[in-house]
Amino acid sequence: SSSLEVLFQGPGLNDIFEAQKIEWHEENLYFQGEPAVYFKEQFLDGDGWTSRWIEKHKSDFGKFVLSSGKFYGDEEKDKGLQTSQDARFYALSASFEPFSNKGQTLVVQFTVKHEQNIDCGGGYVKLFPNSLDQTDMHGDSEYNIMFGPDICGPGTKKVHVIFNYKGKNVLINKDIRCKDDEFTHLYTLIVRPDNTYEVKIDNSQVESGSLEDDWDFLPPKKIKDPDASKPEDWDERAKIDDPTDSKPEDWDKPEHIPDPDAKKPEDWDEEMDGEWEPPVIQNPEYKGEWKPRQIDNPDYKGTWIHPEIDNPEYSPDPSIYAYDNFGVLGLDLWQVKSGTIFDNFLITNDEAYAEEFGNETWGVTKAAEKQMKDKQDEEQRTRRMMRTKMRMRRMRRTRRKMRRKMSPARPRTSCREACLQGWTEA
């Protein structure tokens, strides 16, 4: 069977009050029934993926290949889409039966493995409406949600979570750090109908909260009162000059004075050299600028805080989370160094199912993947050591040869004669 599954398992009306768990969230009534799997792709059928995924028609875009990479936990199960050409844009997408997440949870999940030790490149997915022209998917194509890791230099190692709200891409206000090692990692985004969200990496929560709090979808609830302004007599000075303090009479002394110890050189010629002036020195009695003593300001009122009012432009939106139409999952990326592998894509409405699926895919092969990598690293270390040893041996041999060349020729006599002649070994 195809590894791309599109299933509709909505609740039957007869079962609603028996088998279904009914949850009430603000104005949203929704049913928690059998998991609906809108999209699942594990690349388990060889080249079958090529008929399900569509590439952008542009010759200079990078090619995806099916591969489990240089190391893996299971050579077949860990096969995924791997970027194969450096410094390229990539555009590949798969469509599925369109659905809306209104009144239900949305879970987007996939694995990413940057086995190339990535320097700059995307590892995120975009969810598009089914109106997308897949042959012309590009960076400006309007999407619903963008989610996943992104690395570019030391400054960017983050998980993007971007929602298109009323035609505008809105970025999360939190910084979620992504994994930047060479192993496979599981990324999960959960968006719930109560306008809350959760981001998981490797099936562990790394961020959660409310959509309204963590994105700028809506105008702020409060604004500074435009009719309020600081009263003119509002005194924000904590300290003031002491009006009773006055400068001592002997305070003002020049900063520099002529050096009293300086003497005019004997060979000084006033006609030739002009009038002699002694060099100046720092005046030890100079006290600097006089400043009156500071006292507490009796009129001090503190820092004026601009009062806030309810923002008349704010109104809550209980359906921030909801989209009418999801129909395409796309990889729209740039990679400087290629080698990233994408696998185990899942779009569902069931958090528990997604977690289970993650454990059965990424969870099952992660230990073996690390083992294989460790073994490869060990072998590489051994090879490096062997190479180093060989190099050292060659160097020693070369040095010996050089020494022999440099030392005087040994006389062809017996040892006894040689000793008598006073010849010693070099």
Partner: antibody, heavy 127, light 107 residues
């Protein structure tokens, strides 16, 4: 934070070309998009084009297409703007400005604004 | 091509709230940035992504954006806020600036 230092003032004859440089320091050059913006005396800001050094490709405002060339040399962390076929209306202060990428896509800088500007280079075109 | 329209000038009394608008077709769907420019100086980014403040920009600067209008609001305006202000957005990989607004602080 990155700092941008531009080359000195230029006086040019109509029909000639000018090449202005913008050297970045104190940041990773490849993590920024560099825009070139000009301002004629008493006028507003006008975007001419930009480049993202890590992607290598430049894009230009339609008005300047064919007359402006923007390049970047990653080895020296320097961006260049060359404007050809100069006319008196090109007399202006030319600024380079950087926007952080904060992502591996060329569109990321759209979100962050031009947060660092060079000091400006005055170009006078006069016969 | 995309056009952003700003009023040429706005006046405000010290301590009062100044509002500078930037009009554009469906500008609410774009990220809008605002720059302050004082005479003889390079522009300075004061608001990005509609309403976020870069570090070092006073709290009195705020922004909003919806429908066909983006707005820069300066509450408790000070004499030092007198400058030219420009809005900017991206359209089809091209940066577009508004014509600029001269803010005059009276008195």
């Amino acid at each position: 934070e990155v700092q941008l230092v531009q080359s000195g003032a230029e006086v040019k004859k109509p029909g000639s070309s000018v090449k202005v440089s913008c050297k970045a320091s104190g940041g990773t050059f490849s993590s920024y998009a560099i825009s070139w913006v000009r301002q004629a005396p008493g006028q507003g800001l006008e975007w001419m084009g930009g480049i993202i050094p890590i992607f290598g490709t430049a894009n230009y405002a339609q008005k300047f297409q064919g007359r402006v060339t923007i390049t970047a040399d990653e080895s020296t962390s320097t961006a260049y703007m060359e404007l050809s076929s100069l006319r008196s209306e090109d007399t202006a202060v030319y600024y380079c400005a950087s926007s952080p990428l904060r992502g591996s896509g060329w569109y990321w800088h759209y979100y962050y604004g031009m947060d660092v500007w060079g000091q400006g280079t005055t170009v006078t075109v006069s016969s | 091509s995309y056009v952003l329209t700003q009023p040429p000038s706005v006046s405000v009394a010290p301590g009062k709230t100044a509002r500078i608008t930037c009009g554009g077709n469906n500008i609410g769907s774009k990220s809008v940035h605002w720059y302050q420019q004082k005479p003889g100086q390079a522009p300075v980014l004061v608001i990005y992504q509609d309403r976020k403040r870069p570090s070092g920009i006073p709290e009195r600067f705020s922004g909003s954006n919806s429908g066909n209008t983006a707005t820069l609001t300066i509450s408790g305006t000070q004499a030092m806020d007198e400058a030219d202000y420009y809005c900017q957005a991206w359209d089809s990989s091209t940066a577009v600036f508004g014509g600029g607004t001269k803010l005059t602080v009276l008195g």
